[in-house]
């Protein structure tokens, strides 16, 4: 014969524990039902009656099976430098993250405490290390043979186009200008963008070596804050 299935509430066998989605009520000394996510315990169980659960009220939630008397309050509305990436529902708390083009300059256990705009590399400088959710962009000077003519937190240094005859030589902040209508080949058809990271988990982007028509003398600016005068700017 199959073992008898006990219905909550029931007294557990000595030395045994309650089953999944049940908890041991010290007062009743019984195994009782937990409430599902999105609910809370309205009335605790007794020896003869099981837990009575009720739905969480607006702006409150429970994420796990539980027997809490009150649901948890959802966090405050997102600050103006943040966006809501997960709404407050009966089963999950609101999640706020820094808005696009910003990163978390100071993270705390409960989320991002301070968001800051990603550093923009100015003309003559390109992105050496892209920004992540928790780290700023690192800029580097464009090496000989490469340039960047934008103020951007995503553009890297691009190689100068190769000309049959050069009208104006390129420099760190300007592409070469050719005399003929079309260059023999262009290695830089358009601005190269580094994608904004979606998540920083397991993301360890290394700056990619950039093609150069001249010996590279590029260097990374310090890991810490790179001086704004050295190729980065504010918003």
């Amino acid at each position: 014969l199959p073992a008898q299935v006990a219905f909550t509430p029931y007294a557990p066998e000595p030395g045994s524990t309650c089953r999944l989605r049940e908890y041991y009520d010290q007062t009743a000394q019984m195994c009782c039902s937990k409430c599902s996510p999105g609910q809370h315990a309205k009335v605790f169980c007794t020896k003869t009656s099981d837990t009575v659960c009720d739905s969480c009220e607006d702006s409150t939630y429970t994420q796990l099976w539980n027997w809490v008397p009150e649901c948890l309050s959802c966090g405050s509305r997102c600050s103006s430098d943040q966006v809501e990436t997960q709404a407050c529902t009966r089963e999950q708390n609101r999640i706020c993250t820094c808005r696009p083009g910003w990163y978390c300059a100071l993270s705390k256990q409960e989320g991002c405490r301070l968001c800051a705009p990603l550093r923009k590399c100015r003309p003559g400088f390109g992105v050496a290390r892209p920004g992540t959710e928790t780290s700023d962009v690192v800029c580097k000077p464009c090496a000989p043979g490469t340039f960047s003519n934008t103020t951007s937190s995503t553009d890297i240094c691009r190689p100068h186009q190769i000309c049959n005859v050069v009208a104006i030589p390129g420099n760190a902040s300007m592409d070469a200008v050719c005399t003929s209508t079309s260059p023999t080949r262009s290695m830089a058809p358009g601005a190269v963008h580094l994608p904004q990271p979606v998540s920083t988990r397991s993301q360890h982007t290394q700056p990619t070596p950039e093609p150069s028509t001249a010996p590279s003398t590029s260097f990374l600016l310090p890991m810490g804050p790179s001086p704004p005068a050295e190729g980065s700017t504010g918003d």
Epitope: S76, A105, S107, L114, T134, G224
Partner: antibody, heavy 124, light 112 residues
């Protein structure tokens, strides 16, 4: 006890640079951030910028963005503020103050510890 | 940027009498973590600023209980229940809810 000790007064000519230091003691330096504030003679307080001593992340006031750099040396528990291309209106007392950081999990207090101030005079 | 305004800008008070300073922010200072990062600082003549109140109403250690802070959202008040001679100075409200941190213009408290 917890304190921030700043470097001495400086006199500079317009166009020059100045680097002010702020040495922390009595607490774990990398558990907090450092904020820099300045005060021109007879004026109010102006926030200059902030540096997370653990990560090196910075944020500067927009009007100073192109001229200021804040750094830390964790080996000596010292924060630095460098201001370049000095002008006469940069004449002020410069303060560093401790702010919360990634490791300060206790209650938030705000700018609870201040340096004594460093007078920077810009004059030709 | 969040703009902080203070009233009055000057407050001559009689010793032993109460004083009140108002501070208003151009937008709510409630952070998504539920905290409101509004502080009050005191600056006595010739001295660096000193933290009095943090997160609207919490007195910092060593601050006399005659100082109290209140408010919510965008409107905040610092009260001195009985002004003493050592309370002379300039009082600033400041927000650190988001970058850039901003100060009020300051309120000068002196004795009549």
């Amino acid at each position: 006890q917890v304190q921030l000790v700043q470097s001495g007064a400086e006199v500079r000519k317009p166009g020059a640079s100045v680097k002010v230091s702020c040495k922390a003691s009595g607490y774990t330096f990398t558990s907090y951030s450092v904020t820099w504030v300045r005060q021109a003679p007879g004026q109010g307080l102006e926030w200059m910028g902030w540096i997370n001593a653990f990560s090196g992340n910075t944020h500067y006031a927009q009007n100073l963005q192109d001229r200021v750099t804040m750094t830390t040396d964790t080996s000596t528990s010292t924060a630095y503020m460098e201001l370049r291309s000095l002008r006469s209106d940069d004449t002020a007392v410069y303060y560093c103050a401790r702010e919360e950081g990634s490791g300060s999990y206790e209650d938030y207090y705000g700018m609870d510890v201040w340096g004594q101030g460093t007078t920077v005079t810009v004059s030709s | 940027d969040i703009v902080m305004t203070q009233t009055p800008l000057s407050s001559p008070v009689t010793l032993g009498q109460p004083a009140s300073i108002s501070c208003r922010s151009s937008q709510s200072l409630v952070h998504s973590d539920g905290n409101t990062y509004l502080s009050w600082l005191q600056q006595r003549p010739g001295q660096p600023p000193r933290l009095l109140i943090y997160k609207i109403s919490n007195r910092f250690s060593g601050v006399p209980d005659r100082f109290s802070g209140s408010g919510a959202g965008t409107d905040f008040t610092l009260k001195i229940s009985r002004v003493e001679a050592e309370d002379v100075g300039v009082y600033y409200c400041m927000q650190t809810t988001q970058f850039p941190f901003t100060f009020g213009p300051g309120t000068k408290v002196d004795i009549k």
